[in-house]
Interface confidence: medium
């Protein structure tokens, strides 16, 4: 057993261009709080996992209140370190999520409001007992520096804190066979309590006679490397030998969870979802608050308003669970109308659309025709993907409304002159010419070239273009 | 922020990793893109990998990459790579509003890597 | 497929004045349209999202228009740091195509 403690030195502006600005204004003062999340070895876990060595959450910052026209400077940081108990065996590595949270704290209805304002996460190698280690990460134009260490906790000492130590029982030496306890030199290691054989380095026991693997060793004394290559059958070698793993008892025979948790088997192990108020890797943790940070993938933590619910975990979109540890399938609520296929980008959901639809759900027909009247007795035209108007003479544009100029096209032939005709058009044809466009020239002797003009239109008079 | 790494100088068909590591947000929450630049052209998409771990390509990408990611990685592999391959290969994370009241989704690749060069010769 | 046509492929202005880059979408991408600054050897830079939606940090003097199909990039009071390839890409989902994110064919701007 022992405790992670992180110490925030500074959070602020990083030193490349683009000064983020001040997360809090005159108007809207806020104060800054973080959230460590811890999680065993350097395996590629999901970044929705659960916080397997633990979590914790800082007190909250001083107030503060940005300068105006004032550049973002270090924000005042809350007191104190950050510390994560650890009950098993400090693993040696180690992933880190650690979030900075502001609380605004402006005239909000229901109470404070918090954002996230940067998120760094790293994976380290680390051992328990050694001295500060010094960081600086950076998320987007913020830049968080900060110190951590893993210490073990009395009577733990060790690189995993797995040896046990004891006051001595005699002033000057420690009984026969045992070391002194570096670096508390007054104390001295307990009797071997482990299997016999157990690896000193890759072992652990917590019972009398056990003996417990730390990640990535296996075999009934921890000495043998888990292979990363598959076995050959299950008949194949022996795990003895290999470091194989063959197939035994399942790692959620007998329910390890505790407290009413459900197992369910991962690659590795296994994983337990637990009840409201219980957490840790067996669920065997209670009287959760939300100092203990339970609420995983940037959820939020309210205090319970009775003890049977210490803390109520407000998740962001995508997330669901007592502590917002269960990615929600929201394509399942099927939000796309008209066939369209839903797709979850993680920040957004989007539609894609059949032919036809279009919007953020499809839900728009674009080849319907009702309530997309045309102005001016034009009619509706379906197909290619989008309604058209056909327009009645006189009239244009997409909806009809444009009123058309018919004689912009200069339709009037061999020098006539365009009227514009409530109907249409009408042609005064130049002496010598005649039809509706001016098209026909006028014989001499009074008879019009193809066709003959209209009884009681004399040539020369306004033609009518109907 | 994001950076790519693992371009090299690599010969016709030797498959090739490429990998992008994020830090400041969670892959779990950003859709991540993959862009390529040929010397002297412009960019061009060959796929993203949503929040969930789903990837989508570009019709003519598809089979010639493979987009995977890790909780603070992505990777691209290029499977069997050709002459005209050889690019610089971008990561980018994708923005856009969560919910869209209208049609304006307002999606965008920010922020970009400084890139990674490939060069595919024999 | 969607394609992403730009106009001109190259432009030159002198300091203090103003260009204007045309993009073409092939079908309707509904305002989702995405502008970005690329300088030689650099990575590409968001300018301008949702088609007209300045990125902070970006100087007003970038503007962005357009809808439906046709989107233009507007860049006045032109200064030397301008000089860059500027690219279009559609950012529209709903639609049955083969290349989600297209971007155009690239914008030099020339700064005299």
């Known amino acids: 057993a022992g405790v992670f403690e992180l110490q925030i030195h500074s959070f602020g502006p990083g030193p490349g261009p683009g000064a983020p600005r001040s997360p809090c204004s005159a108007r809207l003062p806020c104060r800054l709080f973080f959230r460590v999340c811890l999680k065993p070895g350097l395996s590629e876990e999901a970044a929705e996992s659960p916080c397997a060595l633990g979590a914790a959450l800082s007190a909250r910052g001083p107030v503060y209140t940005e300068q105006p026209g004032a550049p973002a400077p270090d924000l005042p940081l809350p007191d104190g370190l950050l510390q994560v108990p650890f009950r098993d065996a400090w693993p040696g590595t180690f992933s880190f999520i650690i979030e900075t949270w502001r609380e605004e704290l402006g005239d909000q209805i229901g109470g404070p409001a918090w954002s996230l304002l940067a998120r760094v996460a790293g994976r380290r190698r680390l051992a328990a007992g050694g001295p500060w280690a010094r960081d600086i990460q950076r998320a987007g134009a913020w830049e968080l520096r900060f110190s951590y260490r893993a210490r073990c906790e009395p009577p733990a000492v060790g690189t995993a804190c797995t040896r046990l130590c004891r006051p001595r029982s005699a002033p000057s030496r420690c009984g026969p066979g045992l070391r002194p306890c570096a670096p508390l030199e007054d104390e001295c290691e307990a009797p071997l309590v482990c299997r016999a054989g157990c690896s000193p380095e890759h072992g652990f026991c917590e019972q009398p006679g056990e003996c417990r693997c730390l990640e990535g060793w296996t075999g009934p004394l921890c000495t043998v490397p888990v292979s990363t290559s598959s076995c050959l059958s299950p008949r194949g070698p022996s795990s003895a030998t290999t470091g194989c793993l063959v197939p035994g008892p399942g790692p959620c025979d007998g329910n390890p969870c505790a407290n009413g948790g459900s197992c369910s088997e991962t690659p590795r192990s296994f994983e337990c979802t637990c009840p409201r108020g219980f957490y840790g890797l067996r669920c065997e943790v209670s009287g959760v608050t939300c100092a203990d940070g339970p609420c995983f993938n940037g959820g939020l933590c309210v205090g319970g308003a009775d003890p049977d619910s210490a803390y109520i975990c407000h998740c962001p979109p995508g997330f669901q669970g007592s502590n917002c540890e269960k990615r929600v399938d929201r394509c399942s609520l099927q939000p796309c109308r008209n066939g369209g296929l839903c797709l979850d980008l993680g920040h957004a959901l989007r539609c894609r659309c059949r032919a036809g639809f279009a919007g953020p759900r499809c839900e728009h027909d674009l080849d319907d025709c009702a309530g997309r009247a045309c102005a001016n007795g034009g009619t509706c035209v379906e197909g290619g993907g989008a309604h058209r108007c056909s327009c009645a003479l006189g009239f244009g544009g997409r909806d009809c409304r444009e009123r058309a100029d018919p004689c912009a096209a200069r339709p009037c032939a061999h020098g006539g002159r365009c009227y514009a005709h409530f109907s249409g058009l009408v042609c005064a044809c130049a002496p010598g010419y005649m039809g509706a466009r001016c098209e026909f020239p006028v014989h001499p002797d009074g008879a019009s070239a193809l066709p003959a003009a209209p009884p009681g239109l004399r040539p020369g008079d306004p033609q009518r273009y109907l | 922020s994001v950076e790519e790494s693992g371009g090299r100088l690599v010969t016709p068909g030797t498959p090739l990793t490429l990998t992008c590591t994020v830090s400041g947000f969670s892959l779990s929450r950003y859709a991540m893109s993959w862009v390529r630049q040929a010397p002297g052209k412009g960019l061009e998409w060959i796929g993203i990998?949503?929040?969930?771990?789903d990837p989508y390509y570009a019709s003519w990408a598809k089979g010639r990459f493979t987009i995977s990611k890790t909780s603070t990685t992505m990777d691209l592999k290029i499977t069997s790579p050709t002459t005209e391959d050889t690019a610089t290969y971008f990561c980018?994370?994708?923005?856009?509003?969560?919910?869209?009241?209208?049609?304006?989704?307002?999606?965008?690749?920010?922020?970009w890597g400084p890139g990674t060069l490939v060069t595919v010769s024999s | 497929a969607l394609v992403m046509t730009q106009t001109p492929s190259s432009v030159s202005a002198a300091v203090g004045g103003t260009v204007t880059i045309n993009c073409q979408a092939s079908q309707n991408i509904y305002s989702n349209l995405a502008w970005y600054q690329q300088k030689p050897g650099q990575r590409p830079k968001l300018l301008i999202y949702g088609a007209s939606n300045l990125e902070s940090g970006v100087p007003s003097r970038f503007k962005g228009s357009g809808s439906g199909t046709e989107y233009t990039l507007t860049i006045s009071d032109l200064e030397c740091d301008d000089a860059a390839i500027y690219y279009c890409?559609?950012?529209?989902?709903?639609?049955?195509?083969?290349?989600?994110?297209?971007f155009g064919g690239g914008t030099e701007v020339v700064v005299k």
């Open positions: 980018a994370r994708m923005i856009g509003s969560e919910y869209a009241s209208s049609s304006e989704y307002y999606d965008a690749f920010d922020p």
């Open positions: 990998i949503t929040g969930g771990g």
């Open positions: 890409q559609s950012a529209y989902y709903t639609t049955s195509v083969d290349v989600l994110y297209p």
